[in-house]
Interface confidence: medium
């Protein structure tokens, strides 16, 4: 499919001008290659009319130009003094005319309306309001006022001052007679429809002395604004419908076959399933404007979108609307990353988030999409060392591996962690990607004790059992804090006996804390990694208490204080069940608060939007650089 994009249809009137914008992927080659505008012949072929290399056909001499905007990835063709002869099929493109790097454009030039003398022209957008002013003389001040519409050869009464309203205009038209000082009446038509366009006649009086005024009403269908975005990127539709519809329900819909427009999202709470987890409708401003953000763009998202206002929250005749034609460029600069990441309850996930590598210094964020109230995304963690309180000890954002990718690790997974998450930066806002975390059945691979208590001044040894499947991975222990997870020395104690059917390649790696101090209290992670790519992690909370009896503590899986949410296995090892381990020092009320996520709408329909990849999670060795 050609990555070139432009307007499918351009309509104008004889004598007027048009400006046609064509988009291309702004690669170095594309920016500098030839741009052209050609007319398609009946037998194929395309005859160049103007190009960026200076060529201008005699047909366009003195009335057309082509300007390239390499920094935007666009070029613009301006054509003036249009005639009906200019109607036809054209291409805008790059390189050689026949190469296929082009987009088809249909140009329709119509004759201007043949208007009667003294005709006032009203040009109004679809769905808006028009006021037709009708002057009259004093002798007709007390006589009937009326507005007719010319249908074919006959004038049809639309409204009059005796109270008649044509059924086609019911509920959206009124006739106002100005105060005695002004010899003027006006007809106001709301929620204009395309069918309202045409010639009108207003009249004061019914005899040969009546005053008449001709009006020509042109109702404009909004020209779609062209929007060119990368596959996997995001788009924002800014919809400004005006203050008169500030209190009317708003919607964004996508045109399907014919005149159908399927609601994508509206302010009445409707949201299309295909956009679950990747759409936000921003609150409307006092002037009735609002915006819709869609992330994780797919090929099938391309098409014509309309935003509008109607009490039903969907497109109806007479809705004021704005239109966009979205083109999704498949030659995307945004790298592929898994759209679904699966994690086992009690274990972890490591999510890779792409960002624009030119913006390595930008702040990175991760947020949880919530479906409530038209979608929102509370931030959970950022690269400046902030972590939402409920996620302390189990969430970390790493700048690694860098060069266009950062990593987010979430461990101690529970079923409540299932949902959609957004990767964000404060740089190029088009780089917003979405990942769905699914919680699946299974056992965590890494085995660690539950919460551990260390004694001040003594030595603590905490084991982490790695199955043989991780034999080729680097194994580590680290201490979690808001800015990451700082690497700690650890000892390989040889093969682990924690796994059935696992050979000598399994490993027991211990963390040793010598001469424990209060500062040693906190969360510790053990994990695996390969280079800068992180695998599974497991978390242990170490509490510190006063000395009771001398000696050092060597915590085995079986020995650690059994908590209500843990069970001792026959093999003598204890396994942590599917619960997030909270700081044991929290009071019961605080624990409840820390364990309750901001209430989302509860409905989290899973949408597999692409590649699915099972992943583990982990932590980091390096501090953030602020």
């Amino acid at each position: 499919k050609s990555p070139i994009f432009g307007p499918e249809e351009v309509n104008s009137v004889e004598g007027n001008s048009v400006s046609i914008t064509c988009y291309y992927p702004p690669t170095s080659v594309n920016r500098h290659t030839r741009k052209y505008w050609c007319r398609q012949g009946a037998r194929g072929g395309c005859i160049t009319l103007i190009s960026s290399e200076g060529y201008v056909s005699s047909k366009y001499a003195g009335r057309a130009n082509l300007t390239n905007f390499p920094e935007n990835g666009t070029f613009v063709v301006n054509i003036a003094q249009l005639s009906q002869d200019d109607s036809g099929r054209y291409k805008c493109g790059l390189g050689i005319n026949s190469r296929g790097l082009s987009f088809d454009v249909s140009l329709e030039v119509s004759q201007g309306p043949g208007l009667l003398n003294d005709t006032k022209v009203y040009t109004v957008d679809l769905g808006r309001t028009v006021t037709i002013n009708c002057p009259f003389k004093t002798e007709n001040a007390q006589k009937r006022k009326s507005l007719y519409k010319q249908i074919g050869l006959y004038p049809v009464l639309v409204i009059d001052s005796s109270g008649y309203v044509n059924p086609n205009y019911t509920g959206r038209i009124r006739l106002d007679i100005q105060g005695t000082g002004q010899l003027l009446f006006s007809v106001v038509i709301n929620q204009l429809r395309l069918s309202d366009a045409g010639q009108y006649l207003c009249q004061a009086g019914d005899d040969s002395n009546s005053n008449k005024k001709n009006a020509d009403l042109q109702v404009l269908k909004p020209e779609p604004e062209l929007v060119y975005e990368d596959l996997r990127g995001s788009v924002t539709f800014h919809c400004a419908l005006g203050p008169e519809v500030a209190n009317v329900a708003k919607f964004l819909c996508r045109q399907s076959s014919g005149e159908n427009c399927d609601v994508v999202v509206n302010t009445l709470g409707k949201r299309a399933p295909a956009f679950e987890g990747r759409i936000l409708l921003n609150p409307q401003d006092k002037d009735g404007s609002f915006s819709v953000v869609i992330t994780g763009l797919r090929k099938e998202d391309a098409g014509r979108y309309l935003c509008g206002a109607h009490s039903d929250g969907q497109l109806q005749e007479g809705s004021p609307i704005q239109a966009w034609q979205l083109f999704v460029n498949e030659e995307s600069t945004i790298p592929r990353s898994p759209t679904v990441v699966k994690g086992v309850a009690g274990s972890s996930v490591a999510v890779l988030c792409p960002y624009n590598r030119k913006e390595s210094k930008s702040i990175k964020y991760w947020c949880l999409w919530e479906g409530a109230q038209n979608g929102r995304c509370p931030l959970l963690v950022d690269s400046e060392g902030w972590v939402k309180a409920q996620y302390e000890g189990r969430l970390s954002l790493l700048e690694e591996p860098g060069n266009g990718t950062f990593t987010v690790i979430l461990n101690q997974l529970t079923s409540r962690d299932a949902g959609f998450y957004w990767c964000l930066t404060n740089g190029d806002t088009l780089w917003r990607t979405t990942v769905e975390i699914k919680i699946i059945e299974g056992e965590p691979n890494l085995k660690v004790p539950g919460n551990v208590t260390a004694v001040l001044g003594e030595t603590l040894k905490v084991p982490c059992h790695f199955p043989c499947k991780f034999s080729s991975y680097e194994k580590y222990w680290c201490k979690w804090n808001n800015t990451g997870c700082q690497a700690l020395p650890s000892q390989d104690e040889g093969p682990s006996k924690a796994f059935v059917n696992c050979d000598e390649n399994s490993r027991l790696v211990s963390l040793t804390l010598n001469l424990v101090t209060r500062a040693d209290e906190g969360w510790y992670w053990c994990g695996v990694k390969q280079g800068h790519f992180y695998g599974e992690t497991a978390a242990v909370y170490v509490a510190v208490e006063e000395r009771k009896a001398a000696g050092s503590r060597d915590v085995s899986l079986a020995k650690a204080d059994a908590a209500p949410d843990e069970k001792v296995l026959d093999s003598g090892f204890r396994e942590i069940e599917n619960k997030a381990i909270q700081d044991p020092r929290l009071f019961a009320e605080e624990k409840a608060v820390a364990d309750t996520r901001d209430q989302a709408d509860g409905s989290r329909a899973s949408v597999d939007s692409g590649s699915s990849e099972e992943q583990g999670g982990s932590s980091r060795h390096h501090h953030h650089h602020h």
Epitope: N282, R376, C377
Partner: nanobody, 124 residues
Framework: EVQLVESGGGLVQAGGSLRLSCAAS????????MGWFRQAPGKEREFVAR????????DYADSVKGRFTTSRDNAKNTVYLQMNGLKPEDTAVYYC?????????????????WGQGTLVTVSS
């Protein structure tokens, strides 16, 4: 956590104007939804205005619509409340608040960071 400090309050005559500023420190607020609230003596704290992360979407209490305007300068990590046509009933302590929500609707309970407030007194 972000720290917010309001300034610009004071005594003004009815019909006058004031511009309140809210300077944030501790972290960048360019993905925060920011809000203004006020509390008159003996009354509950009430919502005044909010502005989304980009500054493109604002929202106001009915009592201040058309008179108050909120804006933000993300480069300066600062949010503003321009108050025109002040009335005696606007007298209150004005608070700036931040919510770590990326876009979308934000309810009052979502504002987690608060300033100490600045007093605005409107005399008749």
């Amino acid at each position: 956590e972000v720290q917010l400090v309001e300034s610009g309050g004071g005594l003004v005559q009815a019909g006058g104007s004031l511009r309140l500023s809210c300077a944030a420190s501790g972290r960048t607020i360019n993905t925060y939804v920011m809000g203004w609230f006020r509390q008159a003596p003996g009354k509950e704290r009430e919502f005044v205005a909010r502005i989304d992360w980009s500054g493109s979407s604002t929202d106001y209490a009915d009592s201040v619509k058309g008179r108050f305007t909120t804006s933000r300068d993300n480069a300066k990590n600062t949010v503003y409340l321009q108050m025109n046509g002040l009335k005696p009933e606007d007298t209150a302590v004005y608070y700036c608040a931040g919510s770590a929500y990326y876009s979308g609707y934000v309810t009052h309970r979502d504002f987690g960071s608060w300033g100490q407030g600045t007093l605005v007194t409107v005399s008749s």
